[in-house]
């Protein structure tokens, strides 16, 4: 769809005469009729297949025609067309004298013609005007013309429809060739896909608008590359979502069991040494001269029994000295390596002595791991989900939440691109390795069969007597350009003389 524009600039008729040589009375009140049609090697009479237009009286005898596009839109003259511009044309411009106000062809005397010019040639779509001047014996006409596409039509032939938009269905403007140009922050075939914040994690993050990074469940942070620990987790972290890996000094499934009461609560007074002795329990080893559970009571040196775990106290000049039994060490015999007696195995793990009781090992029940059976086995640790699927622990099993375009227990199957019937107008869809291809029915084309292509009405050779056939793309009908000596819609009738113009 486009417009042939004709800008009349100046008409010279110094003597004020008609084509017959007769002068106009009182002067030649001049108006123009324009006929635009398909290309003819010799411009001949016949239908104005591309359109016609007439002007009002523009001046008398010789005059310049002012640009009136902003006013009433009379100059340049507009000849719109609703078909693919063929690139060639024929143009007939007639100057007529109007004795009265009625400019209809039937209201004018046949000798009211002042001059007639006919040109033909190639014309590409574009913004630049072609300037031309045609001179006859008595008149001169200066004019310019061009073909431009209608709003939302693009390309060399004004055949590509593209309408800019910025909504749910796309965010783009149109390039001069009709291709889409995505607005900043959008991508994809129809610019519907936002470009997420730079660095946003490909699997864990997504966005609904440009420069955004929203996290899928279980992930957090600006780029969605930090996991969220389990809902019940108290003193733990994670390396994958919903884990609970205990901070130092904490144990249990939710890291809520205090294995380091000494550090967390500092219960021992008067410089006593604190020893953890199980969950939420501790032992204070008092300095000489102190006693009590938390070494809060003052005593004399060996009277306070400073030696722990059966150690014997020996008075010395500068204090005292503890002799420790086997398996214990330290200033007050307060240190021992944990043994099975300390019940160090969680979640029903069984304890086995090693090295004559000097240390131990835990044998964990199914679903638990860690040196103290303190960690629950995470079925998602092995990353069983393919193609960026999200793994979720579901009771005794696991399941994968697949990203768009994938399916299957482990997201291992690629969903067919053809499943959403992308081919328009009954096109046949073919799955390819990197996308899809549409095979279009007759009359349609484009990547998705979305472009309607005209039927070639000339294919059946309807014109007789070696006439040239042209397709009128606005109606999918044909026009026959007859050779000399023939007339009729199919050039089927021989005649003696060419008929005069019917308009």
């Amino acid at each position: 769809s486009g417009v042939f524009q004709l800008q009349l600039q100046e008409f010279i008729n110094e003597r004020g005469v008609l084509a017959s040589g007769r002068p106009c009375e009182p002067g030649c009140r001049t108006f123009f009729r324009v006929c635009l049609k398909h290309f003819q090697a010799v411009v001949s009479p016949g239908p104005c297949t591309f359109g016609t237009v007439s002007t009002p009286v523009l001046g008398t005898n010789s005059f310049a025609v002012r640009d009136d596009s902003s006013g009433g839109g009379r100059n340049p003259l507009q000849l719109p067309f609703n078909f693919t511009w063929p690139g060639t044309f024929s143009l007939i411009i007639e100057a007529w004298h109007a004795p009265g106000d009625d400019l209809r062809p039937e209201a004018l005397p046949p000798d009211a013609l002042i001059s007639k010019i006919a040109i033909q040639g190639s014309l590409a779509v574009g913004q630049n005007w072609l300037l031309d001047e045609q001179t006859s014996t008595l008149t001169r006409l200066r004019y310019s013309y061009r073909v431009i596409c209608s709003d939302n039509y693009y390309g060399d032939n004004c055949s590509r429809l593209c309408k800019k938009r910025n909504d749910h269905f796309g965010h783009y403007v149109c390039q001069p060739d009709g291709n889409l140009s995505c607005l900043p922050g959008w991508t994809g075939e129809y610019c519907q896909q936002p470009i997420c914040l730079s660095g946003c994690h490909e699997q864990n993050g997504y966005c609904s608008k440009p420069a955004e990074c929203l996290c899928r469940p279980g992930w957090q942070g600006r780029l969605c590359n930090e996991c969220i620990p389990h809902n019940g987790c108290r003193h733990g972290t994670c390396s994958t979502p919903w884990q609970c890996t205990c901070d130092e000094g904490w144990g249990g499934l939710f890291c809520d069991q205090d294995l380091n009461y000494c550090t967390h609560h500092s219960p021992c007074k008067n410089g006593a040494t604190c020893s953890n002795s199980g969950q939420r329990s501790y032992t204070c080893t008092c300095r000489p001269g102190y006693t009590g559970v938390d070494c809060e009571l003052e005593l004399s040196e060996c009277d306070s029994n400073p030696c722990r775990n059966g150690g014997s106290c020996k008075d010395q000049e500068d204090g005292y000295h503890c002799l420790c039994p086997p398996g214990y060490y330290g200033l007050h015999c307060e240190h021992s390596t944990l043994s099975c007696a300390d019940s160090p195995c969680f979640n029903g793990g069984s304890c086995r002595e090693r090295n004559q009781g000097a240390n131990y090992a835990c044998e964990c029940p199914p679903n638990f791991t860690g040196s103290n059976c303190e960690k629950k086995v995470d079925r998602c640790t092995s990353n069983p989900c393919a193609n960026g699927g999200q793994c979720l622990n579901r009771g005794p099993s696991r399941m994968c939440r697949c990203r768009p375009g994938f399916t299957g227990t482990y997201c291992e199957l690629h969903v067919s691109d053809c499943a959403r019937n992308p081919c328009a107008h009954g096109g046949t869809c073919h799955d390819l390795e990197n996308g899809l291809m549409c095979t279009c029915p007759a009359g349609f084309s484009g990547r998705r069969c979305e472009v309607r292509t005209s039927i070639d009405a000339c294919a059946s050779s309807p014109c007789f007597n070696r006439a040239t056939c042209y397709t009128d793309l606005s109606t999918d009908t044909f026009v026959c350009n007859c050779p000399y000596g023939f007339v009729g819609s199919r050039c089927e009738f021989p005649v003696g003389l060419p008929p005069s113009f019917p308009w």
């Epitope: 996290c215 279980g218 992930w219 957090q220 969220i228 809902n231 108290r234």
Partner: antibody, heavy 118, light 107 residues
Framework: EVQLVESGGGLVQPGGSLRLSCAAS????????MAWVRQAPGKGLEWVAT????????YYRDSVKGRFTISRDNAKNSLYLQMNSLRAEDTAVYYC???????????WGQGTLVTVSS | DIQMTQSPSSLSASVGDRVTITCRAS??????LAWYQQKPGKSPKLLIF???DLADGVPSRFSGSGSGTDFTLTISSLQPEDFATYYC?????????FGQGTKLEIK
């Protein structure tokens, strides 16, 4: 035991400001994302804002964007909500909760009432 | 925003009854749904997350089911302490949204 204790609520005029605080204990505060959720009198629950645990990324509901600011001080085990340009429709009990916009809210404080009225 | 619609908005039942509350999402939220219990003057308490996982310390008479858009909270045998308002919440889309609540009263 996990404890979240809000403070800073009260009566404020439209257009005024208020700063809510939430003191956390019983869990390693710096390991977890936090949120504010509100409940207008006699109405349902409405998420207000969220902050991630380490890099402090924030998200807000559209109606409070540009007016409210969520922040945290991991050293003090504290969460904050700075509320400016308050409106009558911001009147609600404001709860401090442990969670993100894409996870459940596992623990909640007792709430603090904010009343915006002239 | 995703709309969460609970039904019924209120219901009366007796101790020992089996009670079901439903929650419908305006879009597919997979299994990213939680249920909360709130008693008058108190803060909400997490009961169930990921549709059917019981939160720590929640009695086994509470259970959840569903996926996609339709979800259910079931209390198998009502106890006196269960009379409260129950809310569902989706956390699959931003912003997270809650249902309008279901008030469970003693008959």
């Amino acid at each position: 035991e996990v404890q979240l204790v809000e403070s800073g609520g009260g009566l404020v005029q439209p257009g005024g400001s208020l700063r809510l605080s939430c003191a956390a204990s019983g869990f390693t505060f710096s390991n977890f994302p936090m949120a504010w959720v509100r409940q207008a009198p006699g109405k349902g629950l409405e998420w207000v804002a969220t902050i991630s645990s380490s890099d402090g990324t924030t998200y807000y509901r559209d109606s409070v964007k540009g007016r409210f600011t969520i922040s945290r001080d991991n050293a003090k085990n504290s969460l904050y909500l700075q509320m400016n340009s308050l409106r009558a429709e911001d009147t609600a009990v404001y709860y401090c909760a442990r969670g993100y916009y894409n996870s459940p809210f596992a623990y909640w404080g007792q709430g603090t009432l904010v009343t915006v009225s002239s | 925003d995703i709309q969460m619609t609970q039904s019924p908005s209120s219901l009366s039942a007796s101790v020992g009854d089996r009670v079901t509350i439903t929650c419908r999402a305006s879009q597919d939220i997979y299994i990213n749904l939680a249920w909360y219990q709130q008693k008058p003057g108190k803060s909400p308490k997490l009961l169930i997350f990921d549709t059917n996982d019981l939160a720590d310390g929640v009695p086994s008479r509470f259970s959840g089911s569903g996926s996609g858009t339709d979800f259910t909270l079931t209390i198998s045998s009502l106890q006196p302490e269960d009379f409260a308002t129950y809310y569902c919440q989706q956390y699959d889309y931003v912003p997270p949204t809650f249902g309008q609540g279901t008030k469970l009263e003693i008959k």
